[in-house]
């Protein structure tokens, strides 16, 4: 059965979260995609989204979040730079497909940001613009304001299954392994 996993990333303030969400490219390549935070007891909140239609490998920067949608590979890359302790939380990628509800992607990311500074090489570069050399880009359309209330629950509904396996049972598995990511600032 396909499982909706939750990966835990432990990082320090100032570091960069660099993750990816995959999707069925034949179905969702040009669909608008978004990065959301899920706070306990609240509806998921959209923090950034790609353009509509989504452009291939065209970086969209919203504050400290950079999204790059690699249509031809079926991957959405998400970077959160210069992390702050208050960025800690549970995140997910979704695909907007109005009028249907957003389609949740694999995997959910449990981000834990702690104070302190890592001595990993390159960790002293904290300027987003210097690091990424990406001109800030605003999306052509605002991110949709609605979010399905169904994505708030801990056990996701079957509708969030990979489209290629619609009958798969989805289990939210708590992954205990912690991914400690080297600094890329």
């Amino acid at each position: 059965a396909t499982k909706l996993t939750e990966e835990k990333y432990e990082l320090k303030e100032g570091q960069t979260l660099d993750v990816k969400c995959d999707y069925t490219l034949e179905k969702f390549a040009s669909s608008q995609k978004a990065w959301q935070i899920i706070r306990d007891g609240e509806m998921p909140k959209t923090l950034a989204c790609t353009e509509r239609p989504s452009k291939n490998s065209h970086p969209v920067q919203v504050g400290r979040i950079i999204l790059e949608d690699y249509h031809d590979h079926g991957l959405l890359r998400v970077r959160m730079v210069n992390l702050q302790v208050e960025d800690s939380g549970l995140y997910q990628c979704v695909i907007y497909q109005p009028p249907k509800e957003p389609h949740m992607l694999f995997d959910r990311i449990r981000l834990v940001v702690t104070k302190g500074f890592s001595g990993t090489p390159g960790s002293n570069e904290n300027s987003t613009q210097n690091v990424y050399k990406i001109p800030p880009t605003t999306t052509k359309a605002l991110c949709p304001l609605y979010t399905s209330p169904r994505t708030v629950t801990q056990a996701p509904p079957k509708s969030t299954a990979d489209v290629s396996t619609p009958d798969s049972e989805i289990n939210l598995t708590n992954v205990t392994d912690i991914i400690r990511v080297p600094v890329f600032n």
Partner: antibody, heavy 122, light 107 residues
Framework: QVQLVQSGAEVKKPGASVKVSCKAS????????INWVRQATGQGLEWMGW????????GSVQKFRGRVTMTRDTSIHIAYMELSSLRSEDTAVYYC???????????????WGRGTLVTVSS | DIQMTQSPSSLSASVGDRVTITCQAS??????LNWYQQKPGKAPKLLIY???NLETGVPSRFSGSGSGTDFTFTISSLQPEDFATYYC?????????FGQGTRLEIK
Amino acid sequence: QVQLVQSGAEVKKPGASVKVSCKASGYTFTRYDINWVRQATGQGLEWMGWMNPNSGNSGSVQKFRGRVTMTRDTSIHIAYMELSSLRSEDTAVYYCARGGYTSSWRHYFDLWGRGTLVTVSS
Amino acid sequence: DIQMTQSPSSLSASVGDRVTITCQASQDIRKHLNWYQQKPGKAPKLLIYDAANLETGVPSRFSGSGSGTDFTFTISSLQPEDFATYYCQHYANLPITFGQGTRLEIK
């Protein structure tokens, strides 16, 4: 033992298809990407694409698009790479390689199969 | 696509020598660079990831450095088992590409 075991050598005629298998053991198959890399005799390494064994989603580089299909069977921890419309220049050793966590951008290949030689000849 | 250019393409050295291989990216890849060793008839082996991090179990005579477009791979004291072909590989964006390889031969 953590390893990737690939299927044996194949000889195919131009226009045919080949399906290479890669069996994972010793780790959680669905938590790491599987990548496919090929190497023609005496040549360098060429990345073909990736697959997330959990979701089943995959992507490939432009030159293989429409010819390559990456699938998996999670019940037996096997990843497959099928290449169709074979031509002589597809003669190469095909490697499967474990990538990073399915959620991580870090694409490094820390575990490799021994390779499968595919010969395309009329 | 990002081009990765390794130099030299081949070099001869003796046991005990210090050997340096360079890899140049056609654009800024920050530290998104890995190094592999490949012996004839064998699969590649990851040595260095993220430009400078030594993979578990790899001897400390291997090291990597660099950031942006210029990277260096060093073997501090060449051992007989180090004669092989070495490749760099970037993952700053997609597609992932490898350098053309550097063949290290016995002098």
